[in-house]
């Protein structure tokens, strides 16, 4: 089996260009192509990989939603030479373009990192933006978090940094097959430095310390933060919105995917993508966008632009 | 039917400026890469310069970068290169061509620009 | 110098197949990445004539076919015509230079 091979950090990666094909492992016989795209208040941007997988063929889109940060999640897998470029990976641009100064700021400050490289999303060095309320929605907290793709053998992972509407959530994710977008909430102007190490002790109840008796020399006892997961099963339908339920992560368990897609934990990938040749050096994030008149789901099915004749 | 009408070319002394349009119909504008590609008289293709379809991810041929700028506007279903400091070696006719599946597949008619002094 | 190697001319006579070569290197065709043919007809511009390494846009004859192996690919045209006269471009992308690059050029003169 013959597939086509790319891989997307809010690059142009996977561009018309870029492709390459690659011949897969014995006992492949799935090319896959999995996209996922992140919008904030203040733009989007995708991940993407193209190559040999492994599983049925299928299709899954998925809509999530994490306090106002909304990702669309597409796999498509085939059993043909070269079919995996179906999925339009390429993001809408705005017509016109998105006008962020119609838009009150509601006080809230955040750094924003949409498409960014995790160098340059670092600490204090990414942009800072203003919060505004959109669609009916407060954002008046500031995330710091992951999108995290996996397909053809190969993870891609992005920072994700932005206003959200929840200023406490803690470790919290949403996720699709292969497709997972977490991170932790904060209250304050750019609290969102780096949330990595955020506890889910909230700051205004201060943490319960067990210090150990001051005579004898007993072990230490550690005070132990255990927190619930809420599984959530997939619906049916091949497309939903998805959202988390608590404070702590709500995750899609691997086990309970839609059926027409791989099982993630079940069967590894294999085959792999080859790496994309360099990175966009010269521009920015592909795609990189402001919400104001977006399309809700920009990307969501489509085609590429077909050669003469397609393909 | 898919057209692309390139026009801006002519006569310029080293060291110049100019600027070519490429105007595109026939096909969802905003949703295609573009790119320049000129070619030196009885010589063969270079690439110039692409831009992706939202006009955030620009690349440059090391011969032209710091020089050429490339932009689109997709309201106006317009792809441009402004070409700033001329040099001889850039005389050439310049093509805008449409980025489709992975290839150049619609190419202009194609604009001459004369850098002599 | 180009970065993709083809050979300056090539012939053939009417009803006779002809082959064009094109030589790239682990950082284009060797990288994985697909080749693509252009045609240019005397005083025109390029028209695509194949593209990801073996496909044919429509209107393309099917005299016209590609291949790739390795760091290289071929253009094969069977059953050549007066009208097949032209010059002929290879082109991939390349990861050293950050785009795409094109061969050389072949010049095909169908002779008689």
């Known amino acids: 089996l013959e597939c086509y091979s790319c891989v997307q950090k809010a690059d142009d990666g996977c561009s018309p260009h870029r492709m390459k094909t690659v011949k897969c492992g014995p006992g492949v016989d799935v090319c896959t192509e999995a996209v996922g795209a992140v919008e904030t208040i203040h733009g989007q941007f995708s991940v993407a990989v193209r190559g040999c997988g492994s599983g049925i063929p299928g299709k899954n889109d998925r809509g999530l939603d994490l306090h106002g940060l909304l990702a669309f999640f597409q796999l498509q897998q085939c059993s043909e030479d070269r079919c995996n470029a179906k999925l339009n990976l390429t993001l809408r641009g705005l017509n016109p373009a998105g006008n962020e100064s119609a838009y009150e700021p509601n006080g809230a400050e955040c750094y924003s990192c949409v498409g960014l490289s995790r160098e340059k999303c670092q600490g204090s060095m990414p942009p800072v933006v203003n919060c505004y309320n959109a669609s009916g929605r407060v954002y008046k907290g500031c995330f710091d978090g992951n999108v995290t793709l996996t397909a053809a053998n190969v993870t891609v992972s992005l920072p994700v940094r932005g206003c959200v509407q929840d200023e406490t959530c803690t470790r919290d994710g949403v996720t699709g097959p292969g497709f997972t977008l977490s991170g932790s909430c904060c209250q304050g102007p750019r609290c969102n430095a780096d949330l990595r190490n955020k506890t889910y002790f909230s700051p205004r109840i201060p943490p319960l310390v067990l210090l150990p008796p001051p005579t004898t020399a007993a072990p230490s006892t550690r005070a132990q933060n255990s927190s619930s997961t809420t599984s959530t099963a997939a619906p049916t339908t091949t497309t939903s919105i998805i959202k988390p339920t608590t404070a702590q992560a709500s995750h899609t368990s691997p086990h309970e995917m839609d059926l027409e897609v791989i099982q993630e934990e079940g069967a590894s990938l294999s085959g792999g993508a080859a790496g994309h040749g360099g990175t966009a050096g010269h521009g920015g994030a592909a795609g990189h966008q402001d919400r104001s008149n977006m399309e809700k789901y920009p990307g969501k099915g489509g085609a590429q632009i077909p050669a003469k004749g397609g393909s | 039917e898919v057209q692309l009408l390139e026009s801006g070319g002519g006569l310029v002394q080293p060291g110049g400026s100019l600027r070519l349009s490429c105007a595109a119909s026939?096909?969802?504008?905003?949703?295609?890469?573009m790119s320049w590609v000129r070619q030196a008289p009885g010589k063969g293709l270079e690439w110039v310069s692409y831009?992706?379809?939202?006009?955030?991810?620009?690349y440059y041929a090391d011969s032209v970068k710091g020089r050429f700028t490339i932009s689109r506007d997709n309201s106006k279903n317009t792809l441009y290169l402004q070409m700033n400091s001329l040099r001889a070696e850039d005389t050439a006719v310049y093509y805008c061509?449409?980025?489709?599946?992975?290839?150049?597949?619609?190419w202009g008619q194609g604009t001459l620009v004369t850098v002599t002094s | 110098q180009s970065v993709l190697t083809q050979p300056p001319s090539a012939s053939g006579t009417p009803g006779q197949r002809v082959t064009i070569s094109c030589t790239g290197s682990?950082?284009?065709?060797?990288?994985?990445?697909?080749v693509h043919w252009y045609q240019q007809l005397p005083g025109t511009a390029p028209k695509l004539l194949i593209y990801d390494n073996n496909k044919r846009p429509s209107g393309v004859p099917d005299r016209f076919s590609g291949s790739k192996s390795g760091t290289s690919a071929s253009l094969a045209i069977s059953g050549l015509r007066s009208e097949d006269e032209a010059d002929y471009y290879c082109a991939a992308f390349d990861d050293r230079l950050n785009g795409p690059v094109f061969g050389g050029g072949t010049k095909l003169t169908v002779l008689g």
């Open positions: 682990s950082s284009n065709i060797g990288a994985g990445y697909v």
């Open positions: 026939g096909f969802t504008f905003s949703n295609a890469w």
């Open positions: 831009i992706s379809s939202s006009g955030s991810t620009i």
């Open positions: 061509a449409r980025e489709g599946l992975w290839a150049f597949d619609y």
